[in-house]
């Protein structure tokens, strides 16, 4: 069975894989492939190292660890739903049937759709109830929330007052819109 790893569309995915070199700098060839590990080698190779260096890679696939110490974990840049599936990390130990094989399942989730506001402080000052902050791990995403206790007349008045202001430009630039009615 595969170990499962998750990432969101647009993020980088991380698939861990390690080995201990026999001696510092005494490297072993490694291949990464899309699909479960076959009997030999890797199918659909996306990255390969030899005894000295990374000698083959495709766009968006790279090693961000110190592979000279045996950290051959794969990073997939800017993932899409099509990147979902099983990946094979194969440590190609010399000798017959010595290879170490790891099947890792990558699950890609759709990105959370949230407008990216600019000049958050101006917007919050003018519409103190329109902005809610929801934590999403280390970064926080601002999302437009509901407008309790504000009627359409108040919204219309506020919108008219803002129409020619710098904030209206900010809102337009950020892609946010205020719909009346």
């Amino acid at each position: 069975s595969e170990v499962e790893y998750r990432a969101e569309v647009g993020q980088n995915a991380y698939l861990p894989c390690f080995y201990t070199p026999a001696a510092p700098g005494n490297l072993v060839p490694v291949c990464w492939g899309k699909g479960a590990c076959p009997v030999f080698e890797c199918g659909n190779v996306v990255l390969r190292t030899d005894e000295r260096d990374v000698n083959y890679w495709t766009s968006r696939y790279w090693l961000n660890g110190d592979f000279r110490k045996g950290d051959v974990s794969l990073t997939i840049e800017n993932v899409t739903l099509a990147d979902s599936g099983i990946y094979c990390c194969r440590i190609q130990i010399p000798g017959i049937m010595n290879d170490e094989k790891f099947n890792l399942k990558l699950v890609i989730k759709p990105a959370k759709v949230t407008p990216a506001p600019t000049r958050q402080r101006d917007f919050t000052a003018a519409f103190p109830r329109m902005l809610t902050t929801r934590g999403h791990g280390p970064a926080e995403t601002q999302t437009l929330g509901s407008l309790p206790d504000i009627n359409l007349t108040q919204i219309s008045t506020l919108a008219n007052e803002l129409r020619d202001s710098r904030l209206a430009n900010d809102l337009r630039d950020s892609g946010a819109t205020i719909r009346i009615g």
């Epitope: 170990v3 894989c17 390690f18 201990t20 110490k69 045996g70 440590i91 010595n98 170490e100 094989k101």
Partner: antibody, heavy 123, light 106 residues
Framework: EVQLVESGGGLVQPGGSLRLSCAAS????????MSWVRQAPGKGPEWVSH????????KYADSVKGRFTISRDNAKNTLYLQMNTLKPEDTAVYYC????????????????WGQGTQVVVSS | SYELTQSPSVSVALKQTAKITCGGD??????AQWYQQKPGQAPVLVIY???RRPSGIPERFSGSNSGNTATLTISGAQAEDEADYYC?????????FGGGTHLTVL
Amino acid sequence: EVQLVESGGGLVQPGGSLRLSCAASGFTFSSYAMSWVRQAPGKGPEWVSHINSGGGNTKYADSVKGRFTISRDNAKNTLYLQMNTLKPEDTAVYYCAKDVSGGYYGTYALDAWGQGTQVVVSS
Amino acid sequence: SYELTQSPSVSVALKQTAKITCGGDNIGSKSAQWYQQKPGQAPVLVIYADSRRPSGIPERFSGSNSGNTATLTISGAQAEDEADYYCQVWDSSAAVFGGGTHLTVL
């Protein structure tokens, strides 16, 4: 969830033998190297032995070489440590631990540990 | 045989930054791991491959390794971080642990 459960510890006289077992679950046991690590009362961890994922490569600390034997049964998801000619200085809590790698050449990092089994060597 | 040297104790004020070091000959050429151990419990891996953090380990834990020193940094130490910390490397044919550092959070 990864689980490692050690058993087989106990009180034994100097020169005696014990066999420790570690039952593994929650991961593909046959893909990962395993280690035994011991900890004497009030001391830090001391690595004892390592076995690679396939079971063909084993390593031992100098202090136990020739007396201890590590083995594994991948069909039973179980790790073993056969301890012979035990000495008072072997008294410790013995932990089995899972490696992050297949460990052909050695231990990388131990990312899951059991709760340990107590071994006391005393007359 | 290879030796890893840790200072026996380090103190840090609550929410301040603690640094725990592990000295070894050219340790920067090896992959360094750090384990946290609380009384009566098994060790827990908090940093591996010099600076990688296992899932479930808070972001305040980070690691670095170069030259003759590996360092575990706890940014914004919490009361629950009070524990013993051990570094570990693989050297030729043996895993080696440092003597441990007891972190006190004041």
